[in-house]
Interface confidence: low
């Protein structure tokens, strides 16, 4: 195989498109999109660069040997050996590698306490909403509905354990059962994968790292959605998490003990604090239909307060208003209590940024939503620099093997199911599901972790995640205990079940497949990858609930055509790719249909001509300070991943004006080199291989 | 132990007085609810007077109003049902009982053995 | 004042059998409802309390349903211990009152 593929009569005249470079440097291919390495030869001659326009669009022919896309790339070093160091090279080196490991860690937590910010913004925008999601009275009688309303509680406010605390409370508070909660907490589980999902596009300026992150992000969509449809109708029929987890709350005298352990949260919480401090409670009082609770904030204003107490004569509609520790008494007309009424004094303000501001929490919340993201980015970016500047060469080499090469035979199987272990751990200690997959997601981007390892590490990380909420339940007050340690027990093993289902026989890893179809799609459509998150994980469970507020009898009415489509698409698609021959000829292939029902290509453009003008001055922007610029926007490629700079170069090809932009599919070490900007090694060099 | 023990029940004639005390222990008696429940021989339960933690608030059963008067000594961990112009309808075993599961202040979660009270010429 | 109205009177069941007794209110009591049990010669004890919550230290087999004036107590599967008098009583509004009692036997 070639290493560049051939232009077969692309051009009348090639030389007018090619610009010789002055530096006599050969061509390199980038290892990433090449492996066979025979035609690698170096001619020392003036190289030539294959201009944007036409350097693949022209293409006649596919090569025929075609690179496996979700091959990790092999990611060059550009260091010089340390043998071949001086003693000041040396010592530049340490401190470079120092300053990057302390650079990375910044970049690391300012990651994650964005994350917290990201989710505290989240619930400013829709936690109200989200809690009437909860006092909804339909919950009790319709799974369905359960399901929905958890994943929308968990999307709006962006934490699984939120809405699972709602939960809790309210199954606490008899206002539902545990079987009415289930579907709620298994609609959580599959609200959380959202955020690594996010952190995924945000890597989408490269289309091979895109790809291999979102499907990286996306696997954990696919298990949570294909666990549901399976596990769903079995607990509908037979309540086995119920049972089960009755059974083992029944079995032990459980003793509540001391709070789960806060490990991540120590470092995070004081600066996160600063940014701002929500009142959670809210949220749970609109839930358990409290009035009074929707006019309040829930940004929290005073944090020191002091409570006097002092007792009082008042009058009650009934009893079902007396107080505890109180007696109701009547004197024929009216009932009376002895309430103790509460003075709240305060004392000292919150110390964070909105604290003087009297902002609408919907303000706050997207003033908040926008630095998050900008913040998340901006971290995302740097991480993934760092990462590809450090994981290079031998360190790269040693990584990739350690963490992606099983155990020696026969104990090959035993390696996912320690990955599982490290996932579950990792997280744990993290104490959060959406931190541990969402830092994994850029190593999954950038190449270190191949997402068939990524697969059993985010498994693991839902095993991690309920074990953490196993802890805080041990850990809740009496009257809350057996609830809210049922609730996180069925979380346990709905996940488990989850796992059995779909990761022990290779054969049934259909979420690694699946995710790898999404991301080639997306890779190719990345607006595909938005359309995708918007349909997911906002428009499929709105329109559940919507019919499912309309009744059993719209739902089954509109749910049951549209399910006998999808399976008979499927049978379809299943016949067409494996036994064609037992289908008639028009139904072989999907030409039948008009072309926007079977391929993305007419919507795609549609979607380019309605995104076009966004993205024409992001790129006039990139021409001026491409670096800065790319950097800010968060789109460190933008210069050669969107459409219209494409556009924009051939205008300006038209008109004499030569422009050297790598193209959509090139990688950006060759264009570096391309450009002369290959550096003699000295001691300055990038230093990774040890 | 959360205990209740009650003393102060026996023989006494129609129009007569006695004096009932309930010892409680093992728990903050002055944060709680406490009440008189009887019953009659064979027959059910029923409430005769309960007084507020502090002492400051009581409640009669219609039955018993101006006869009976329920009081609390928080310093001696005991209350009292003073009865008086006994009737044979009041004999009965008195239990003194704890009132206030949190939330539901008039459950009655602890009680005493009981005392009986007899009322008879 | 509050009736409340216990059935059946007396019953009697084996070990091992599925029990429920009613208790009616003569007006709405919302879900302010409890139930006690009574050994002959002890004092009552709470098994359930605000019609379902149950009391601390009470068996799981003992639950309470109902909300407005119809309520039950269900013992799910009957044990040696659990024959006793069974008592409801509406905490909505004053006077408290009982029902008349249910006397569970052994068959």
């Known amino acids: 195989m070639a290493p560049w593929p051939e232009l077969g009569d692309a051009q009348p005249n090639p030389s007018k498109y090619l610009e010789g470079a002055t530096s006599q440097q050969p061509i390199t291919p980038d290892k990433s999109k090449e492996t066979n390495k025979t035609d690698n030869t170096e001619v020392p001659v003036t190289k030539f660069e294959l201009l944007p326009t036409y350097s693949t669009a022209t293409l006649i022919e596919e090569p025929t040997e075609v690179d496996d896309p979700w091959n990790l790339p092999t990611l060059q070093d550009s260091g010089i050996k340390w043998s071949e160091r001086d003693a000041k090279g040396k010592i530049l080196c340490v401190f470079q590698g120092i300053g990057r490991l302390i650079l990375l860690l910044g970049f690391l937590y300012f990651f994650v306490c964005s994350l917290d910010v990201l989710s505290s913004a989240f619930q400013l925008v829709g936690g109200k909403m989200a809690g009437q999601f909860f006092s909804n009275s339909s919950i009790m009688s319709n799974p369905l509905l359960g399901l929905v309303i958890g994943v929308l509680v968990t999307v709006f406010v962006q934490s699984s354990s939120t809405s699972t605390s709602i939960v809790v409370s309210m199954v606490a508070s008899s206002l539902l059962t545990v079987r009415a909660a289930i579907p709620i907490i298994m609609g959580a589980n599959i609200g959380t994968s959202i955020t690594n999902t996010i952190v995924a596009l945000m890597q989408v300026g490269d289309r091979s790292e895109f790809r291999r992150a979102f499907a990286g992000a996306t696997v954990h969509d696919f298990f949570n959605w294909l666990s549901v449809l399976v596990l769903l109708p079995v607990e509908v029929a037979t309540h086995y998490l119920e049972v089960v987890t009755q059974l083992i709350v029944e079995s032990f005298h459980f003793k509540n003990g001391e709070d789960a352990p806060d490990l991540l949260k120590v470092i995070t919480k004081p600066f996160t604090k600063l940014i701002v401090q929500l009142d959670k409670k809210v949220i749970s009082q609109i839930a358990m239909n409290d009035e009074t609770a929707k006019n309040k904030s829930l940004v929290k204003i005073w944090c020191k307060t002091f409570t006097n107490m002092t007792q009082m004569n008042v009058t009650v509609p009934s009893m079902a208003n007396c107080t505890s520790h109180s007696l109701c008494w009547t004197d024929g007309i009216q009932i009376w209590t002895m309430k103790n009424v509460t003075y709240k004094e305060n004392i000292a303000k919150c110390q964070h940024i909105f604290v003087n501001f009297h902002l609408p929490d919907l303000a706050v919340g997207i003033i908040l939503l926008i630095i998050s993201l900008l913040v998340l980015c901006g971290c995302l970016i740097m991480i993934v620099k760092i990462l590809g500047s450090v994981l290079k060469g031998q360190v790269a080499t040693v990584i990739k093997k350690t963490i992606n090469t099983d155990f020696p035979f026969p104990f090959a199987w035993l390696t996912g199911y320690l990955a599982i272990l490290v996932g579950a751990g990792m997280t744990f200690i993290v104490q959060s599901s959406s931190v541990f997959t969402s830092a994994l997601t850029p190593l999954i981007g950038i190449g270190v972790i191949t997402i068939e390892r990524a697969y059993p590490l985010t498994l693991g990380s839902n095993i991690g995640t309920t074990t953490t909420a196993i802890l805080a339940a041990l850990a809740s007050p009496g009257n809350t205990l057996r609830s809210s340690l049922q609730i996180a027990l069925c979380h346990f093993f709905f996940n488990i079940s989850g796992i059995l289902l779909w990761y022990p026989i290779p054969f049934t890893r259909l979420p690694i497949r699946m995710a790898k179809g999404l991301g080639n799609i997306s890779a190719k459509y990345r607006w595909f990858a938005v359309f995708y998150l918007i349909i997911f994980f906002f428009l499929i469970p709105l329109t559940v609930f919507g019919l499912s507020l309309a009744g059993w009898p719209v739902l089954v009415g509109v749910g049951v055509p549209v399910v006998f489509i999808i399976i008979l698409v499927l049978c379809l698609r299943l016949l067409q790719s494996r036994c064609p021959r037992v289908l008639p000829k028009k139904l072989q292939n999907w030409n039948f249909l008009p072309l926007c029902m079977h391929s993305l290509k007419p919507w795609d453009a549609v979607i380019s001509k309605f995104t076009g003008p966004f993205q024409m001055p992001c790129c006039c922007c990139c021409r001026v300070c491409c670096r800065v610029c790319c950097l800010l926007c968060g789109c460190p490629k933008c210069c050669r991943c969107s459409k219209c700079c494409q556009d924009l170069e051939e205008g300006q090809e038209a008109q004499g004006v030569p422009v050297k932009a790598p193209e959509t599919f090139d990688n950006i070490t060759i264009s570096r080199e391309a450009q002369g900007e290959v550096r003699a090694p000295d001691s300055k060099t990038e230093c990774t291989a040890l | 132990e959360v205990q209740l023990v009650e003393s102060g029940g026996g023989l006494v004639q129609p129009g007569g007085s006695l004096r009932l005390s309930c010892a409680a222990s093992g728990f903050t008696f002055s944060s709680y609810v406490m009440h008189w429940v009887r019953q009659a021989p064979g027959k059910g339960l029923e409430y005769v007077s309960g007084v507020s933690s502090s002492g400051d608030s009581t409640f009669y059963v219609d039955s018993v109003k101006g006869r009976f008067t329920i009081s609390r000594d928080n310093s001696k961990n005991t209350l009292y049902l003073q009865m008086g112009s006994l009737r044979a309808e009041d004999m009965a075993v008195y239990y003194c009982?704890?009132?206030?599961?949190?939330?539901?202040?008039?459950?009655?979660?602890?009680w005493g053995q009981g005392t009986m009270v007899t009322v008879s010429s | 004042d509050i009736q409340m109205t216990q059935s059946p009177s007396s019953l009697s069941a084996s070990v091992g059998d599925r029990v429920t007794i009613t208790c009616r209110a003569s007006?709405?009591?919302?879900?302010?409802l409890n139930w006690y049990q009574q050994k002959p010669g002890k004092a009552p004890k709470v098994l359930i309390y605000v019609t379902s919550s149950l009391q601390s230290g009470v068996p799981s087999r003992f639950s309470g349903s109902g909300s407005g004036t119809d309520f039950t107590l269900t013992i799910s599967s009957l044990q040696p211990e659990d024959f006793a008098t069974y008592y409801c009583?509406?905490?909505?509004?004053?006077?408290?009152?009982f029902g008349q009692g249910t006397r569970l036997e052994i068959k």
């Open positions: 007006q709405s009591i919302s879900r302010f």
């Open positions: 009982a704890r009132g206030g599961i949190t939330g539901a202040p008039l459950v009655f979660d602890i």
């Open positions: 009583q509406q905490s909505y509004n004053t006077p408290i009152t």
